[in-house]
Amino acid sequence: KIDACKRGDVTVKPSHVILLGSTVNITCSLKPRQGCFHYSRRNKLILYKFDRRINFHHGHSLNSQVTGLPLGTTLFVCKLACINSDEIQICGAEIFVGVAPEQPQNLSCIQKGEQGTVACTWERGRDTHLYTEYTLQLSGPKNLTWQKQCKDIYCDYLDFGINLTPESPESNFTAKVTAVNSLGSSSSLPSTFTFLDIVRPLPPWDIRIKFQKASVSRCTLYWRDEGLVLLNRLRYRPSNSRLWNMVNVTKAKGRHDLLDLKPFTEYEFQISSKLHLYKGSWSDWSESLRAQTPEEEPTGMLDVWYMKRHIDYSRQQISLFWKNLSVSEARGKILHYQVTLQELTGGKAMTQNITGHTSWTTVIPRTGNWAVAVSAANSKGSSLPTRINIMNLCEAGLLAPRQVSANSEGMDNILVTWQPPRKDPSAVQEYVVEWRELHPGGDTQVPLNWLRSRPYNVSALISENIKSYICYEIRVYALSGDQGGCSSILGNSKHKAPLSGPHINAITEEKGSILISWNSIPVQEQMGCLLHYRIYWKERDSNSQPQLCEIPYRVSQNSHPINSLQPRVTYVLWMTALTAAGESSHGNEREFCLQGKAN
């Protein structure tokens, strides 16, 4: 009821709580002497549903039959209206419309850990829109039943706060949940289970790993579990992998040997537990243990290449280069590389440890037969050495690969193709394709890249350290025993017209002709491989077309003679450069007047 209802009453029949679709009768009646003062016939009783008038009647009482009420609560208020006065509230009532509870479905119970407590969940079914009380019952051995009630509005979970113990793990327990409201009640189907069915072990804890004698092949994983655990499953993976390795173990008693771990690899380990072979459920996975396996001595051999440079009549410079071992080959942190240089006839040898980089340069006599051996060392040992005899890689002309070409192949790739050498192609043991950024000064500090190709291949795609708009000097070597032949070409993955022309730095007269000298275009402005230079000239103050001379680009060339200028005429000269994509803008302009022979 609403308010004090001093002036009258509102009654609801059959009940304040009704089933959806039912009809209710609402009666509003005034108490004696509570009507309008002068004329009780003038009493006008008005029934409101929330704020909307739904009925009125003159007299001491009002009857109203109401249908079609929605689910939930509806408020009815009765008011009295007298002439020349405001409406007065008489009384009111709330009507609760709902449905009987549906049968709770999918009742399931679980106890988390041997020391945990039993908790059950179920599906309530559709909302009753009424106060509904859920009672959970659990019957078990020793003639005992537990009961707990839930008075939340949306109740689908109850924790009994009671712990099942494993004295008789096969004993049956039966759970049932009953929903009750004013319109009816309904019970779930019973759920029967044993201790072993519902106890979900806590995840293992205190996980540790030990490597006997710091060896990856003698690795044991340790953990702690609840006392009744029978089964464990282990999963582990390298930290950078998404795929797990899985192992199932029975009666492990908190330890298991792992035999297939890779050295010097960070792994993630997790463990789960179960109480019975086919009953119950697995625990959650434990927290991860992350651990790095110990190093083992490197496997595999270094890929070594070299470059020779003539210094003078008696000396040559040897630059050695090698590639890092892969992680799986290095099997640890490479501490240093050991380089041994030996003169094969005299037996002289020198050994040096290189740390921090993968190249080494030395000067040796031009005479004698020289060999190098390079190996990589970690804390556990060294890789097998890679041995190379130092030879003149381009000496055998008949071994030089033919028709070498270099073509752009998509973004930052160059496809290098060649034909086998004229000499018996079957003599070729392997090809080596080498590339480095082209620097006009022939800078030996420029990084060297290479790849090896099988003797039956006549192409290679180079992509490592290839940048757009940079010209590369590419060499293809054919190696056969202690002989080698080579061919070279320039190539780029992407090109456009150079950003500037060459800068003419000098024009000198020499026996009736002139020699033009220029500075190379900076590498970053060449925009690919230069094919030609053009020298333009025309008479000063003339509108005639300039004459031009086109000269093929050569790395080391930075001067060129012109002998078609007239004496005692002032000319303007400038230069451009061309790639396959087009011509650069003009370089600087220089004026020059050829003096000619004195009369």
Partner: nanobody, 129 residues
Framework: QVQLQESGGGLVQDGGSLRLSCAAS????????MAWFRQAPGTEREFVAG?????????FYDNSVMGRFTISRDSAKNTMWLQINNLKPEDTAVYYC?????????????????????WGQGTQVTVSS
Amino acid sequence: QVQLQESGGGLVQDGGSLRLSCAASGRTFSNYAMAWFRQAPGTEREFVAGLSGSGGDTAFYDNSVMGRFTISRDSAKNTMWLQINNLKPEDTAVYYCAAATHVVVSYGLVRKRGTYDYWGQGTQVTVSS
């Protein structure tokens, strides 16, 4: 000095109802386990119903009284009740109130006499046919 005092027993007809009370004094038991036991002449004292004291109270009943007996308590008043409906002659016994100084969370312990530290003097319930 801790005391438990039962009341509400008496003579009642077969099918009748009673409400037994247990008032605790000397300490608060609102968060601890409490139970009702009964003892008929010439028999062992047996568990009837109990409250665990854990997380909003779980009620325990011996299967022989399940559905007829309802155990409850008012923590503020330090009082426990046992509502008995549809009494039968075999319910005739002295009914004892018991209280523990701990929460009972292990299945089965609730029905063991040794679980409880304090006992009342008992109240007689007689059901005549």
